[in-house]
């Protein structure tokens, strides 16, 4: 569970984060699992530990193995495992599957390809980007912060994209490369101002105190893959996660459906054990995309349980 795969190329920098988190003040000890040997913290070592991070500057094939990190909290020692594999550099242009990060998809409008793991490194812009080993040139390609933007994506843009950057550690520079596949969804789509199908504006939903209630926010955004589209719930103008009532939760993930060819999203708000104070809240279904934001407000009202008379 608290184990993470990491990989890199020999003679490049590799930085691995402990799969267990912790406060910055917590001590983190790293060990090479096979020998139980402690990883030094002195930066003069090629492989050294720096708090939550394990640094290979640069990495060698022989560094491959499982590393144990122990985060020492005031109450428990929490253990994580980093499974590190360092590969030899390929002589040809093909990047093997085992060096690939997760695939990303884009559509014809424009697409972002994030450089994987870059947030772990001390790097400075610009990033260099390559597709199938060729440096990317032309106005359609824009290296922006930690991602590549491709304008007017075409099916021919599918392929393997490699980002290359320099990690700086105490004045020394180390090269890092990371590759991921990019696929293009070939659909003639369009984007509209969001249309909320449910709930109706200013809808009053009847609920029973002490029972569970579900509210569904459903909206459509156009046809085909949407570059940016989201539906979410707010309580009294606050994000559900920030509102902090554990009884009220959004359903994990957004369900995507294609209704009459339209791209639609829905988000279910689950209210457990409805309480009187829930009736005082304002529930906002928000749908947003590049065109703008639409909001429908719902309020709850008490549904009196039906009395059964003989």
């Amino acid at each position: 569970k608290f184990s993470k795969q990491s990989w890199g190329l020999e003679n490049e920098a590799l930085i691995v984060r402990c799969p267990r988190q912790g406060k910055p003040s917590y001590t983190v000890d790293w060990y090479y699992s096979q020998t139980n040997k402690s990883i030094p913290t002195q930066e003069r070592n090629r492989v050294f530990a720096s708090g939550q991070l394990l640094k290979f500057l640069p990495a060698a094939v022989a560094d491959s193995g499982i590393y144990t990190c122990i985060v020492r909290s005031p109450t428990f020692n929490r253990t994580g495992y980093a499974n590190v594999t360092i590969y030899k550099k390929q002589s040809d242009c093909n990047v093997p599957d085992y060096l690939m990060y997760s695939t990303v998809s884009g559509s014809e409008k424009n697409s972002k390809i994030y450089c994987p793991t870059i947030d772990l490194y001390n790097w400075t812009a610009p990033l260099e980007w390559f597709k199938n080993c060729q440096a990317l040139q032309g106005s359609r390609y824009r290296a922006h912060k930690s991602f590549l933007v491709i304008d007017n994506v075409m099916t021919e843009d599918a392929g393997d994209y490699t980002c290359k950057f320099i990690h700086n550690e105490n004045g020394a520079n180390y090269s890092v490369t990371a590759t991921r596949s990019f696929t293009v969804k070939d659909e003639q789509g369009f984007s509209l101002f969001p249309v909320i199908g449910a709930p109706a504006q200013n809808e009053i939903k009847e609920v029973e105190i002490g029972k569970n209630a579900n509210l569904t926010c459903s909206a459509c955004f156009g046809k085909g893959t949407q570059f940016l589209a989201a539906v979410l719930w707010q309580l009294n103008g606050t994000k559900i996660t920030d509102f902090g009532e554990p009884r009220i939760q959004q359903e994990e993930g957004q369900n995507q459906s294609f209704s009459n060819g339209l791209a639609c999203l829905d988000m279910v708000l689950r209210i457990a054990d409805v309480k009187e104070e829930d009736l005082l809240l304002q529930y906002d279904c928000l749908a947003l995309n590049l065109h703008g934001l639409r909001r429908h407000t719902v309020r709850l009202s008490r549904k009196n349980p039906i009395d059964h008379h003989s």
């Epitope: 406060k23 909290s73 428990f76």
Partner: antibody, heavy 121, light 106 residues
Framework: QVQLVQSGAEVKKPGASVKVSCKAS????????MYWVRQAPGQGLEWMGA????????AFNQKFKGRVTMTRDTSTSTVYMELSSLRSEDTAVYYC??????????????WGQGTMVTVSS | DIQMTQSPSSLSASVGDRVTITCSAS?????MHWYQQKPGKAPKLLIY???KLASGVPSRFSGSGSGTDFTFTISSLQPEDIATYYC?????????FGQGTKLEIK
């Protein structure tokens, strides 16, 4: 949603033991350590100890070491706190609690409803 | 053990008042958490990591401080804020709480 449901009130004689249960739901039981806090009538809060349901590892307030045992049953997502050699000053409400983000120890965001334990001859 | 000393032990204030509770630790701590407890109820987390507002907690509650001295503030007291408030450190074993501050309405 996260819920911690504790066992009912207990009345015990001095010298006896009491075992309080705390059944967790709404999250992956083994992902979060469970803590025990007690509160004597009209008094403040006192941390007793904790258990990691994944490993069974425990951490205790030295004040209770030797008298308190914490166990878990992963099949029922339940943790238990047993306090032995009870004395009258152990009369208190016993709470189980867990943090919002386990690894970051960011305060006890979730609490059981409490179990009143009365020690009286 | 790190002793936590809250002051005052009790205080009386009027609705709309700014209320401040302090918590002093016998040794330096990295973070402080604050709880509200109403009679017969389990404590409720209000502030974690010294100054972060717990989920769903009104913004009139705030926290600050570092080292050994920490402060909890209610910017404008509301009737529903009547409760006992506790500070808690999670920097060393055993975890310890302040003795509590009982807040009443004038």
């Amino acid at each position: 949603q996260v819920q911690l449901v504790q066992s009912g009130a207990e009345v015990k004689k001095p010298g006896a033991s009491v075992k309080v249960s705390c059944k967790a739901s709404g999250y992956t039981f083994t992902d979060s350590e469970m803590y025990w806090v007690r509160q004597a009538p009209g008094q403040g809060l006192e941390w007793m100890g904790a258990i990691d349901p994944e490993t069974g590892d425990t951490a205790f307030n030295q004040k209770f070491k030797g008298r308190v045992t914490m166990t878990r049953d992963t099949s029922t997502s339940t943790v238990y706190m047993e306090l032995s050699s009870l004395r009258s000053e152990d009369t208190a409400v016993y709470y189980c609690a867990r943090a919002f983000d386990n690894d970051n120890d960011d305060g006890f965001a979730y609490w059981g409803q409490g179990t009143m334990v009365t020690v009286s001859s | 053990d790190i002793q936590m000393t809250q002051s005052p032990s009790s205080l009386s204030a009027s609705v709309g008042d700014r209320v401040t509770i302090t918590c002093s630790a016998s040794s330096s701590v990295n973070y402080m958490h604050w709880y509200q407890q109403k009679p017969g109820k389990a404590p409720k987390l209000l502030i974690y990591d010294t100054s972060k507002l717990a989920s769903g907690v009104p913004s009139r509650f705030s926290g600050s401080g570092s080292g050994t001295d920490f402060t909890f503030t209610i910017s404008s007291l509301q009737p529903e804020d009547i409760a006992t408030y506790y500070c808690q450190q999670w920097s060393s074993n055993p975890l310890t709480f302040g003795q509590g501050t009982k807040l009443e309405i004038k």
